[in-house]
Amino acid sequence: GWVWNQFFVPEEMNTTSHHIGQLRSDLDNGNNSFQYKLLGAGAGSTFIIDERTGDIYAIQKLDREERSLYILRAQVIDIATGRAVEPESEFVIKVSDINDNEPKFLDEPYEAIVPEMSPEGTLVIQVTASDADDPSSGNNARLLYSLLQGQPYFSVEPTTGVIRISSKMDRELQDEYWVIIQAKDMIGQPGALSGTTSVLIKLSDVNDNKPIFKESLYRLTVSESAPTGTSIGTIMAYDNDIGENAEMDYSIEEDDSQTFDIITNHETQEGIVILKKKVDFEHQNHYGIRAKVKNHHVPEQLMKYHTEASTTFIKIQVEDVDEP
């Protein structure tokens, strides 16, 4: 019968010929009367056999990630008779893994959007690296993730690649962050290989800013001949939020005389001061009104940012018109 052990050859061996093992018949008494032959894919080109002894050699550098096993056939012939001593047999040469592949992030580029002011622990995104080395061979493909850039705002779970928020962020201070994640094989031990990826994390806006008047005091004038409904001027607040969160409504907070109104131009986000009642210079020629501004949409959980509406004072001077 045939006698052999399981055959392994390490990948990436640089030697010109590497002894893998011996293949022999138990009828071989060592007098060189038998001839061993190797057949199949790789025979002669990748592997050779010593015809007399049955010793098998790898004569080419192998890459396990390209091909991890070779199935070959062996024959043994009696030189004197030319007959097979043993029936032809199939055997396997396995290419054993070395840590020659760094982890790679295949789903690049990574981009995530997370609301500003999200609490610590909020999941942002999961990044996953893959390692072409053999996961069943030691730690060659066992990865650990770490954060190279992004502290103190982000953290990464070492074994899963899940990125979480570790510190609240304010979009109005910075609206996007580049996080760099490293994946290291060999669970970070010496000889480990690594790969990195960048994650662009954008902060979406939440309504955490109330509108504030640009001026604490405005001065407007109105002619006593102005009809009701006349626009006598504009006031403006600014809101550091964006989009819907920056939409605002202006209103009168104080006007004892009930002479003026304020409407909101939702396109320009300006407040337009309107004459509600005709004025009479001889009766009153100086008015003071207080206006306030509030956001249009404020979710209940964000009301804490909107406790006191911004106000401004508007001095309105009536201009005299000579009466006939």
Partner: antibody
Framework: QVQLQESGPGLVKPSQTLSLTCTVS??????????WSWIRQHPGKGLEWIGY???????YYNPSLKSRVTISVDTSKNQFSLKLSSVTAADTAVYYC????????????WGQGTLVTVSS | EIVLTQSPGTLSLSPGERATLSCRAS???????LAWYQQKPGQAPRLLIY???SRATGIPDRFSGSGSGTDFTLTISRLEPEDFAVYYC????????FGQGTKVDIK
């Protein structure tokens, strides 16, 4: 803190023009929404508002003095001025410059006042 | 023009007493357009109250203002020695006019 300081001659002859200047410090005369006034007080009497000016040059005067009063502004010097023409002894008074308030037309800041006597 | 009449002309009180000063307008004015000032000899008037019950910066809370329509009041709840002075009301709705003043002196 806004401070105002009146300056000008303490003695003016009848029929001449009284000229006073108010220098503003601790704030800009061009601040939006503020009006700069002149007010006077006859000896031992009450207060009389003369007129005001806005930094743009828009002025408004007490109707009883309107024909004789001119108030002007010089934003580069942070000053505003009063001219009162054709003075008589009845114009003898302490003249104050003042700035109105941030929540109304009341007078929040005042100069210390300067006495102008009209006499030949 | 709106004429403001203050009464009494002189109020003689002792320190610690309550002072009530009146200001009456010749026609109705909004309470938002009335102010009170204090003036001591040789000094400029000092804003006390505006609108008509808001205290100006640095004014102690013993000073308070009230009123509406044509009748307005300045109250000094407990007179301090430094409160003896002349007090003026002023309206700033129709041009600007002052009352003739009330003198608060030591009895």
């Amino acid at each position: 803190q806004v401070q105002l300081q009146e300056s000008g001659p303490g003695l003016v002859k009848p029929s001449q023009t009284l000229s006073l200047t108010c220098t503003v410090s601790g704030g800009s005369i061009s601040s939006s929404g503020y009006y700069w006034s002149w007010i006077r007080q006859h000896p031992g009497k009450g207060l009389e508002w003369i007129g005001y000016i806005y930094y743009t040059g828009s002025a408004y005067y007490n109707p009883s003095l309107k024909s004789r009063v001119t108030i002007s502004v010089d934003t580069s010097k942070n000053q505003f001025s009063l001219k009162l023409s054709s003075v008589t002894a009845a114009d003898t008074a302490v003249y104050y410059c003042a700035r109105d308030g941030s929540s109304g037309w009341y007078f929040q800041y005042w100069g210390q006042g300067t006495l102008v006597t009209v006499s030949s | 023009e709106i004429v403001l009449t203050q009464s009494p002309g002189t109020l003689s009180l002792s320190p610690g007493e309550r002072a009530t000063l009146s200001c009456r307008a010749s026609r109705q004015i909004s309470s938002s357009y009335l102010a009170w000032y204090q003036q001591k000899p040789g000094q400029a008037p000092r804003l006390l109250i505006y609108g008509p019950s808001s205290r100006a910066t640095g004014i102690p809370d013993r000073f308070s203002g009230s009123g509406s329509g044509t009748d307005f009041t300045l109250t000094i709840s407990r007179l301090e020695p430094e409160d003896f002075a002349v007090y003026y009301c002023q309206q700033y709705g129709s041009s600007f006019t002052f009352g003739q003043g009330t003198k608060v002196d030591i009895k």
